[in-house]
């Protein structure tokens, strides 16, 4: 499979348009602060060079690895030292250390301005004036803010982004057509970014084995009719794709993802009956569709798992011969029978099974020792079931905003050292589990809820890793990937926390709050709630709810006032004074 010129090979496989887009994404994900024009210039230079290699694979430098070519190009940026500080030191290293160095400097929370959406007419004019630049700018802005965004999927988003403008800029009511589509793309994009971030964290922090275990469980749920060998092949290929994308090898990743989609569609009959529609679509849509495809029906009359994994006298022999293969088969068999379980639960069960075999296969009577292993699964299954039941009841009682507030209080009390913006962002996302998953029937609730929570808690983990402030967060994030959620759930109020000093400025509000969107207004209120809990961690739920209700009434009253600013100043002081007196701030 060796090619004289890797860059020529990828250019020919992907085509010029995708090649340029993927190089732009790669560069923007590495150098997140560089201006758009600088990246476009670098991409054009790389593209021109790739074309010379396509014409003559033996031309000078065409035999160099993509990391060498791209790294050399990134290191030509004049302002590297003043813009990125110590990242510039990466350029003194040789490959592969240089690329590893660039990867380590990816910033999950870059200091970039919030993307403000211009007026629809302004956007449509820009789209018509220069469609290519407009779409490149989209790729650039998303990639630099989401340095682990799944690159081939970002091409799919860009295609939908283009389609939205093509359709809506000709519509009678441009805004009514365009804005809902852009909102949908934004929300789906954030979700896609967070899901991919978990895959990369899984690979980078816990290794290939952890990712493969996750993939075996998920693909076995999705393709329960496929043989174990087929699932194993898909897992191997999928692991390669994600390892490449998470490692910044975006051209190889996109190419291999296309090959995997092609293979899946050519072998639908032995994989899943649900793939037919997906496989009729063009490449980007096809890959996206396969990744989101619903679970196939379980084969009828699957035998009991106990026969092969508990009752058989060959359990320890089979385990000893090929431990990971045997555990993989256990995970495959369990997962295909349980689309109603979360992937992380299935992985906990597999880990329990592995631990039991490790202990029992060394015992005097192995069978006697592991005979009751399935009984150990019961509490592991019941814990997430009960938690989801309780939280869905709370969500249905409170609604999303107040459910988020309950989680804000809960998590601020658990880990009050975490920054307020991170607590607000993470708790708001945790709270979205209600509207996302509680509407589902029992059989779909757990996979929806617990696997979503894994994605959100990973956001907390990657944000906290940048500036660690809490040993408890570090512990829950690093000890076990599959036990992160139970670890956070088990955290009680941090009794060692010293309450934050009271700062009146934190609780001072102005008339600008009246012009904010409902979402932004909620975030302001939730920010105040977190700060309140940090000042008064012993405040009861009732007291905190009362303060929030007072705050809502205060904002409503002052936003209706003739002199809003005076109202905010005077009534704000009174509210702080009343809260201080009642809570002893």
């Amino acid at each position: 499979d060796a090619h004289k010129s890797e860059v020529a090979h990828r250019f020919k496989d992907l085509g010029e348009e995708n090649f340029k887009a993927l190089v732009l994404i790669a560069f923007a994900q590495y150098l997140q602060q560089c201006p758009f024009e600088d990246h476009v210039k670098l991409v054009n230079e790389v593209t021109e060079f790739a074309k010379t290699c396509v014409a003559d694979e033996s031309a000078e430098n065409c035999d160099k690895s993509l990391h060498t070519l791209f790294g050399d190009k990134l290191c030509t940026v004049a302002t590297l030292r003043e813009t990125y500080g110590e990242m510039a030191d990466c350029c003194a290293k040789q490959e592969p250390e240089r690329n590893e160095c660039f990867l380590q400097h990816k910033d999950d929370n870059p200091n970039l301005p919030r993307l403000v959406r211009p007026e629809v007419d302004v956007m449509c004019t820009a789209f018509h004036d220069n469609e290519e630049t407009f779409l490149k700018k989209y790729l650039y802005e998303i990639a630099r803010r989401h340095p682990y965004f799944y690159a081939p999927e970002l091409l799919f988003f860009a295609k939908r982004y283009k389609a939205a403008f093509t359709e809506c800029c000709q519509a009678a009511d441009k805004a009514a057509c365009l804005l809902p589509k852009l909102d949908e793309l934004r929300d789906e994009g954030k979700a896609s970014s967070a899901k991919q971030r978990l895959k990369c964290a899984s690979l980078q922090k816990f290794g290939e084995r952890a990712f493969k275990a996750w993939a075996v469980a998920r693909l076995s749920q999705r393709f329960p009719k496929a043989e174990f060998a087929e699932v194993s092949k898909l897992v191997t290929d999928l692991t390669k794709v994600h390892t490449e994308c998470c490692h910044g090898d975006l051209l190889e990743c996109a190419d291999d993802r296309a090959d995997l989609a092609k293979y899946i569609c050519e072998n639908q009959d032995s994989i899943s009956s649900k793939l037919k529609e997906c496989c009729e679509k063009p490449l980007l849509e096809k890959s996206h569709c396969i990744a989101e495809v619903e679970n196939d029906e379980m084969p009828a009359d699957l035998p009991s798992l106990a026969a092969d994994f508990v009752e058989s006298k060959d359990v320890c022999k089979n385990y000893a011969e090929a431990k990971d293969v045997f555990l993989g088969m256990f995970l495959y068999e369990y997962a295909r029978r349980h689309p109603d379980y979360s992937v992380v639960l299935l992985l906990r069960l597999a880990k329990t099974y592995e631990t039991t075999l490790e202990k029992c296969c060394a015992a005097a009577d192995p069978h006697e020792c592991y005979a009751k292993v399935f009984d150990e699964f019961k509490p592991l299954v019941e814990e997430p079931q009960n938690l989801i039941k309780q939280n869905c009841e709370l969500f249905e009682q409170l609604g999303e905003y107040k459910f988020q507030n309950a989680l804000l209080v809960r998590y601020t009390k658990k880990v009050p050292q975490v920054s307020t913006p991170t607590l607000v962002e993470v708790s708001r996302n945790l709270g979205k589990v209600g509207s996302k998953c509680c509407k589902h029937p029992e059989a779909k609730r757990m996979p929806c809820a617990e696997d979503y929570l894994s994605v959100v808690l990973n956001q907390l983990c990657v944000l906290h890793e940048k500036t660690p402030v809490s040993d408890r967060v570090t512990k829950c994030c690093t000890e076990s990937l599959v036990n992160r959620r139970p670890c956070f759930s088990a955290l009680e109020v941090d009794e060692t926390y010293v309450p934050k000093e009271f700062n009146a400025e934190t609780f001072t509000f102005h008339a600008d709050i009246c012009t904010l969107s409902e979402k932004e207004r909620q975030i302001k209120k939730q920010t105040a709630l977190v700060e309140l809990v940090k000042h008064k961690p012993k405040a009861t739920k009732e007291q905190l709810k009362a303060v929030m209700d007072d705050f809502a009434a205060f904002v409503e009253k002052c936003c209706k006032a003739d002199d809003k600013e005076t109202c905010f100043a005077e009534e704000g002081k009174k509210l702080v004074a009343a809260s201080q007196a009642a809570l002893g701030l």
Epitope: D549, A553, E556, K557, A578, S579, A581, A582
Partner: nanobody, 123 residues
Framework: EVQLVESGGGLVQAGDSLRLSCAAS????????IGWFRQAPGKAREFVAR????????DYANAVKGRFTISRDNAKNTVYLQMNSLKPDDTAVYYC????????????????WGEGTQVTVSS
């Protein structure tokens, strides 16, 4: 003159329902959070429920959650407490209170108090 007048109390059987009313006058009703408190013989006065100036913002003591519902009608300057599935433990004098801040209400403080209405639940 500020007045809060409670009505609707009485003697009922366990499991029955009652609806208490609190009629306010002499102040700008819509600017105040309203709470219901109760005091059983020989016991301290305790918080039952409250409604903020924004009618949807309510809260309840754990003992009454799911059984009692508080609501307000600003046009009539009245607050209601719908009490269902009453228990003998609910026997008390029920007081209505008005306060500028919810946070003071939950700590048992208020600007204005009513005289109370007796609720007796027999088993």
């Amino acid at each position: 003159e500020v007045q809060l007048v409670e009505s609707g109390g009485g003697l009922v059987q366990a499991g029955d329902s009652l609806r208490l009313s609190c009629a306010a006058s002499g102040f700008t009703f819509s600017n105040y959070a309203i709470g219901w408190f109760r005091q059983a013989p020989g016991k301290a006065r305790e918080f039952v429920a409250r409604v903020s100036t924004i009618a949807g913002d309510t809260d309840y003591a754990n003992a009454v959650k799911g059984r009692f519902t508080i609501s307000r009608d600003n046009a009539k300057n009245t607050v209601y407490l719908q009490m269902n599935s009453l228990k003998p433990d609910d026997t008390a004098v029920y007081y209505c209170a008005a306060e500028s801040y919810n946070v003071r209400l939950v700590t048992g403080e208020a600007d204005y108090w009513g005289e109370g209405t007796q609720v007796t639940v027999s088993s």
